[in-house]
Interface confidence: low
């Protein structure tokens, strides 16, 4: 369809509330340091303008693309250079280069303090102005997560508002709110990580990589749908995510709504698990479809070997329509293996492709590819064994101990990576234990590997901003599906020159005593990384002793009448002790 005014078209399709929410998200993801009020002003102006275009599509500037309109708005901010430095240089470019430039300036690790929920204050804000409260939530999440999936953020904002509608009437607001907010926070962080991986796969490895990922995922979830149906959804989904990752949030939300509508209209041929989703309002419907339970496998499936090994036409089919043939292989293999991670399925498809590429050029292709399925077993065994070993370690050490083991492992592999990044990534890797090790055997593999893909993508995104390790660059850029095996295979870096011992790194203060448990752990784990950077060959025994002594030293000073005085006296002694243990 062609419209005279794109902005009028989107406003009419989305309605004022969602339109405003999405515009707010768009601006917050680009200008991550601007105060909320500034954004509200921009949103108000854009909304007023959109309304004039709805009234008259031929009005001045209504025919401009949304990129042009948004970019002009950003570039009109007087303090742009002062607050955002070289982002202002983008304004000298023409579209579409200007938009590309804005995208490159999104900051995945903005210097914004962590949100600390204060139930009483939040309930007061909520009761005073529900609309502002909703907007503030969108703004705070979007500026911290500049690639957050915008239509999904609108969904979470509704849930957030719901939590407050219920809990602000409760006698004990904190008891009602805090566990719910914490649970929602975990969901939101996982959603942010999932979308960041989708955007990275599109931006760094191309649309085909994302389509392959989606094909495997959707085939696992909707095994009753035929290949053509899955392919159509994959194509539409790729368009939606390309738009959102590219900052075209209005188009993305509109297309996502169309896709949800299509899926619901065709649910009989897609999945039996969608009925409930399709009765819900739009945002919940789309969320529900994305999280839908896996449908049961059809009973009458042929063994895979029939079509992909024993069929005499394998090479003919492969040569005539490579992508389609490999797509059907990935579809058929994935729908039969809901227990495999998406990355594992894609590795298997890669091996199948490489085997056909090799065998179909040979004298006797069928003899050559006859054993291709045997080649898959080592690919399956590797992550299974790794997960088994790591889950045993997790059971033995508990979450904190397991995180520390991973901190040691990863600091030795890539000691050049910044300490905050190593701590953040190893802590998140460590959560795989509590997330996946308790799951039934058939869910463990996909749970663990798909989660690790999210965490390693975070490492890759942070490292790309300030590259310091060739090993990390190699694992991050060579192959999306082999990232996890690549990192797993890294050995301790023997070329690393240890850091000088800096006493300041091991200086602690009284504030340590009042920190919440997780922040206390981060302080200790930061010290552990620094210790390893100084002594990369420290033994497990030495590290255990240092950590034990550190815990005792902190406990002693936090029990002392004057915390700060104790840290001042005991701190230097602790440093001498560390140096002695590691000498």
């Amino acid at each position: 369809d062609t419209y005279k005014s794109e902005i009028a078209h989107r406003f009419k399709d989305l309605g004022e509330q969602y339109f405003k929410g999405l515009v707010l998200i768009a601006f917050s993801q680009h200008l991550q340091q601007c105060p909320y009020e500034e954004h509200v002003k921009l949103v108000r102006e854009v909304t007023e303008f959109a309304k004039t275009c709805v009234a008259d599509e031929s009005a001045e500037n209504c025919d401009k693309s949304i990129h042009t309109l948004f970019g002009d708005k950003l570039c009109a901010i007087p303090s742009l250079r002062e607050h955002y430095g070289d982002l202002a240089d983008c304004c000298e470019k023409e579209e579409p280069e200007r938009n590309e430039c804005f995208l490159q300036h999104k900051n995945d690790n903005p210097d914004i303090p962590k949100l600390k929920p204060d139930p009483v204050a939040l309930c007061a804000d909520f009761q005073e102005d529900e609309q502002k409260f909703w907007g503030k939530y969108l703004y705070e999440i979007a500026r911290r997560h500049p690639y957050f999936y915008a239509p999904e953020l609108l969904y979470y904002a509704i849930i957030y508002k719901d939590v407050f509608s219920e809990c602000c009437q409760a006698a004990d607001k904190a008891a009602c709110l805090l566990p719910k907010i914490e649970h929602l926070r975990e969901k939101v962080l996982t959603s942010a990580a999932k979308q960041r991986l989708k955007c990275a796969s599109i931006q760094k490895f191309g649309e085909r990589a994302f389509k392959a990922w989606s094909l495997a995922r959707l085939s696992q979830r909707f095994p009753k749908a035929d290949f053509t149906e899955i392919s159509k959804i994959v194509t539409d989904l790729a368009k939606v995510h390309k738009e959102c990752c590219h900052g075209d949030l209005l188009e993305c939300a509109d297309d996502r709504a169309d896709l949800a509508k299509y899926i619901c209209e065709n649910q009989d041929t897609i999945s039996t698990k969608l009925k409930e989703c399709c009765d819900k309002p739009l945002l919940e419907k789309s969320h529900c479809i994305a999280e839908a339970k896996r449908d049961e496998l059809p009973a009458d499936l042929n063994p895979l070997e029939h079509d992909f090994v024993e069929d005499k036409e394998v090479c003919k089919n492969y040569k005539e329509a490579k992508h389609v043939f490999l797509g059907t292989f990935l579809y058929e293999y994935s729908r039969r293996h809901p227990d495999y991670s998406v990355s594992l399925l894609l590795r298997i498809a890669k091996i199948y492709e490489a085997t056909l590429e090799d065998c179909c050029a040979k004298e006797d292709p069928p003899a050559c590819y006859a054993t291709v399925f045997d080649k898959f077993q080592p690919l399956v065994d590797e992550p299974k064994n790794l997960i088994k070993q790591n889950c045993e370690l997790f059971e033995k050490l508990g979450e904190y101990g397991f995180q520390n083991a991973l901190i040691v492992r990863y600091t030795k592999k890539v000691p050049q990576v910044s300490t905050p990044t190593l701590v953040e990534v190893a802590r998140k890797l460590g959560l795989v234990g509590s997330r996946c090790c308790k799951r039934p055997e058939e869910e463990r593999l996909s749970c663990a590997e798909d989660y690790l893909s999210l965490v390693l993508n975070r490492l890759c995104v942070l490292h790309e901003k300030t590259p310091v390790s060739e090993k990390v660059t190699k694992c991050c850029t060579e192959s999306l599906v082999n990232r996890r095996p690549c990192f797993s295979a890294l050995t301790p870096d023997e070329t690393y020159k240890p850091k000088e011992f800096v006493e300041g790194t091991f200086t602690f203060h009284a504030d340590l005593c009042t920190l919440p448990e997780d922040e206390k752990q981060i302080k200790k784990q930061t010290a552990l990384v620094e210790l390893l950077k100084h002594k990369p060959h420290a033994t497990e025994e030495q590290l255990r002793t240092v950590l034990g002594n550190f815990a005792a030293f902190v406990q002693k000073c936090c029990a002392a009448p004057d915390h700060e005085a104790c840290f001042a006296v005991e701190g230097p002694k602790f440093v001498i002790e560390i140096r002695g243990i590691l000498a």
Epitope: I159, E166, K180, E276, K280, E284, K293
Partner: nanobody, 126 residues
Framework: EVQLLESGGGLVQPGGSLRLSCAAS????????VAWFRQAPGKEREFVAG????????YYADSVKGRFTISRDNSKNTLYLQMNSLRPEDTAVYYC???????????????????WGQGTLVTVSS
């Protein structure tokens, strides 16, 4: 549409234990906010315990905290109420209720639950 069927009620002595079950059909129980309510003769229906949809955050009435435990087994699509240290004032018909829709949200307000079981009687008496 959700169908709920309670079982496990009966006569028990003060200080004793009972485990109520509520089998759900027509919907996955882990996607639904579910709760136990009870109604003693001549009294209003009151909230006992609840668990959010898609999340195991549990809620209890003050009168049962520490004695009752709500849980669900997703593989069996069943909700449970483990009742320990029972008292005569716990005597009532116990109902299981479901509130599909949003995750996280459970409520102590009976009117917000569209789906109910037929109830199971628990009598605590010596």
């Amino acid at each position: 549409e959700v169908q709920l069927l309670e079982s496990g009620g009966g006569l028990v002595q003060p200080g004793g234990s009972l485990r109520l079950s509520c089998a759900a059909s027509g919907r996955y129980i882990d996607e639904t906010a579910v709760a136990w309510f009870r109604q003693a003769p001549g009294k209003e229906r009151e909230f006992v315990a609840g668990i959010g949809g898609g999340v195991d955050i549990t809620y209890y009435a003050d009168s049962v905290k520490g004695r009752f435990t709500i849980s669900r087994d997703n593989s069996k699509n069943t909700l449970y109420l483990q009742m320990n240290s029972l008292r005569p004032e716990d005597t009532a018909v116990y109902y299981c209720a479901a509130r599909p829709g949003r995750p996280l949200i459970t409520s102590k307000v009976a009117d917000l639950y569209p789906y109910w079981g037929q109830g199971t009687l628990v009598t605590v008496s010596s």
